[in-house]
């Protein structure tokens, strides 16, 4: 429970709680923005990204966005909170503990997105379809 | 009975510095992940920086990089917070909290996780 000392205060997403009055430790996740990356056509790839942040709020999850076009890669790492879409879609995997990308339907690129809640679970994005959700042992992990 | 307590708080003038100690006690502390966290007159926790149990690994909020730096003694069982260019929305009531590596919630027990805090307070 929170302490009778330390305040809650009303209306204050900094304070996550459940129903018992626990606090939510935040998320430490990779966050770098957007980088160019060197990441293709590989199983699985690390983020490169040397930067590691405590998540602003405690109900955000770790992100990691890889896009290819015409002309670069880029891999974009940050944390976000999984009830709010992001780059308009919903973030559905972020109960698990692993990043497994999936592809998402954007004009003039290719673009795959992942989720996760484990500490810096963004630093190593997973592409195998062995790792795909459909796997009935992934998904005891991530409902465990 | 686990322990957690806060010291090193006091009045300071912005941009000066202070460092903030946590004792611990009644749990073993090299297995722990250790947090500072921060909450300031009528606002929520801001959760200020953590630092692993073993290699010191640390990680700060954007709000305090490069001003603040985390350590601790596992010899000691003491956690530290060494605040630097101290300014007036660093004013808050300081805590240290304990987190098992992994682990996503605090348990229920108040003792199990929080000190009294200490107070800080920026004003020239």
């Known amino acids: 429970t929170i302490p009778p000392h330390v305040q809650k205060s009303v209306n204050n997403d900094m304070i996550v709680t459940d129903n018992n009055g626990a606090v939510k430790f935040p998320q430490l996740c990779k966050f770098c923005d957007v980088r160019f990356s060197t990441c293709d056509n590989q199983k699985s790839c690390m983020s490169n990204c040397s930067i590691t942040s405590i998540c602003e709020k405690p109900q955000e999850v770790c992100v990691a966005v890889w896009r290819k076009n015409d002309e670069n890669i880029t891999l974009e790492t940050v944390c976000h909170d999984p009830k709010l879409p992001y780059h308009d879609f919903i973030l559905e995997d972020a109960a698990s503990p692993k990043c497994i990308m999936k592809e998402k339907k954007k004009p003039g690129e290719t673009f795959f997105m992942c989720s996760c809640s484990s500490d810096e679970c963004n630093d190593n994005i997973i592409f195998s379809e062995e790792y795909n959700t459909s796997n009935p042992d992934l998904l005891l992990v991530i409902f465990q | 009975e686990v322990q957690l307590l806060e010291s090193g708080g006091g009045l300071v003038q912005p941009g000066g510095s202070l460092r903030l100690s946590c004792a611990a006690s009644g749990f073993t502390f090299t297995e722990y992940r250790m947090w500072w966290v921060r909450q300031a007159p009528g606002k929520g926790l801001e959760w200020v920086s953590?630092?692993?149990?073993?290699?010191?690994?640390?990680y700060y909020a954007d709000s305090v990089k490069g001003r603040f730096t985390i350590s601790r003694d596992n010899s000691k069982n003491t956690l530290y917070l060494q605040m630097n260019s101290l300014r007036a929305e660093d004013t808050a009531v300081y805590y240290c909290?304990?987190?098992?590596?992994?682990?996503?919630?605090?348990?229920?027990?108040?003792?199990?996780?929080w000190g009294q805090g200490t107070l800080v307070t920026v004003s020239s």
């Open positions: 953590a630092i692993e149990p073993i290699g010191n690994r640390t």
């Open positions: 909290a304990k987190q098992m590596p992994g682990q996503k919630w605090m348990a229920k027990s108040r003792f199990d996780y």
